[in-house]
């Protein structure tokens, strides 16, 4: 990561392409992540997105990218960050201190209209997606699948 401090931070609610909300609930001293329809006027959970600039030549990164990328971390509550658990293909909330581990960083994609996608830094080609009303890690095989709705999310200040 180029620089240890984010270039900007943004507090937003996160929803799916189909306008379901991503919510976070404290259960048995740990957080669970849900994808659900909210009732009208129900308050949406907010996530702090911290954006980092990453720069490397493609021969270093191994991902074919030869310039800048935007990395993002997502924190719904103080000291907790979304983590990619590549072994379990799951997305989890972990409490941790900075510097954050690579599993907490996601490459931001926003080349699809006004939606964003989050690709695992630790596992290129694997994205945060929606599966059975939960967030999961989803392997995207072909270029056309980058536009598949279950890995597209919307950010909103409201």
């Amino acid at each position: 990561i180029t620089g240890i401090s984010p270039i900007t931070e943004y507090l937003a609610s996160l929803s799916t392409y189909n306008d379901q909300s991503i919510t976070f609930a404290l259960e048995d001293e740990s957080y669970e992540i849900y994808v659900e329809d909210l009732k009208k006027d129900e308050k949406k959970d907010k996530v702090l997105l911290s954006y980092y600039e990453s720069q490397h030549p493609s021969n270093e990164s191994g991902d074919g990218v030869d310039g800048k990328m935007l990395m993002v971390t997502l924190s719904p509550t103080k000291d907790f960050w979304l983590h990619a658990n590549n072994k379990e293909h799951s997305v989890e909330l972990h409490k941790c201190e900075k510097p954050l581990p690579d599993q907490a960083f996601f490459v931001l994609h926003n080349m699809h209209s006004n939606c964003v996608s989050f690709e695992c830094k630790t596992d290129p080609g694997v994205f945060i997606g929606v599966k059975d009303n939960h967030l999961a890690l989803i392997k995207v095989d072909s270029s056309e699948n980058l536009c598949t709705e279950n890995i597209l999310f919307k950010l909103s200040e409201t």
């Epitope: 030869d66 270029s143 056309e144």
Partner: antibody, heavy 122, light 107 residues
Framework: QVQLVQSGAEVKKPGASVKVSCKAS????????MHWVRQAPGQGLEWMGE????????SYAQKFKGRVTMTRDTSTSTVYMELSSLRSEDTAVYYC???????????????WGRGTLVTVSS | DIQMTQSPSSVSASVGDRVTITCRAS??????LAWYQQKPGKAPKLLIY???RLQSGVPSRFSGSGSGTDFTLTISSLQPEDFATYYC?????????FGGGTKVEIK
């Protein structure tokens, strides 16, 4: 080196179509969106739309929907912008332009073609 | 669509002057704002991105600030090669939109 090479100037009659090409080199073509921006003589910059070379999906400015088509050929790292039903007010320099960050337009546009002048005149 | 309003539309200044250009977005765009310099017959050149980050190779006399809806480009000491037209651009949502431009002319 990293560059965008555009096709040459065109003169078209009202009602005709024009297709401008933009060949990318020196970087991973499918990792960056490609934008089209135009500039009428003595006027400001106007964003027309973007194509995602990875999957071919497009986003067009409302003003151009129905008249503009952006396509790409990954085998030659070339994008195309076709504008139909041309009118005199479409006379402009058309730029293809690449964002400075892979996969994202948030960090601005740092690589520009030299521009293609399209003149619409009867 | 997000409207970007730039002011002034033109400014006359001398070499060594401090020049400030402002840009206002019709709605919040976080820090996703870029500034470009354009000279006649040339393509735009990226100066500043993410509101305040200096693009590689751009002289440090250029600086940017702001977030939300109000942004500023400052040239701390105008040089002869800085006489050009400057544009802001919101990079937050499609359609991307540009300000109307500010022409910096020799006094």
């Amino acid at each position: 080196q990293v560059q965008l090479v555009q096709s040459g100037a065109e003169v078209k009659k009202p009602g005709a179509s024009v297709k401008v090409s933009c060949k990318a080199s020196g970087y991973t073509f499918i990792s960056y969106g490609m934008h089209w921006v135009r500039q009428a003589p003595g006027q400001g910059l106007e964003w027309m739309g973007e194509i995602n070379p990875h999957g071919g999906s497009t986003s067009y400015a409302q003003k151009f929907k129905g008249r503009v088509t952006m396509t790409r050929d990954t085998s030659t790292s070339t994008v195309y912008m076709e504008l139909s039903s041309l009118r005199s007010e479409d006379t402009a320099v058309y730029y293809c332009a690449r964002p400075s960050a892979a996969y994202s337009h948030y960090l601005g546009i740092d690589l520009w073609g030299r521009g293609t002048l399209v003149t619409v005149s009867s | 669509d997000i409207q970007m309003t730039q002011s002034p539309s033109s400014v006359s200044a001398s070499v060594g002057d401090r020049v400030t250009i402002t840009c206002r977005a019709s709605q919040g765009i976080s820090s996703w704002l870029a500034w470009y310099q354009q000279k006649p017959g040339k393509a735009p050149k990226l100066l500043i991105y993410a509101a305040s980050r200096l693009q590689s190779g751009v002289p440090s006399r250029f600086s940017g600030s702001g977030s939300g809806t109000d942004f500023t480009l400052t040239i701390s000491s105008l040089q002869p090669e800085d006489f050009a037209t400057y544009y802001c651009q919101q990079a937050n949502v499609f359609p991307l939109t540009f300000g109307g431009g500010t022409k910096v002319e020799i006094k």
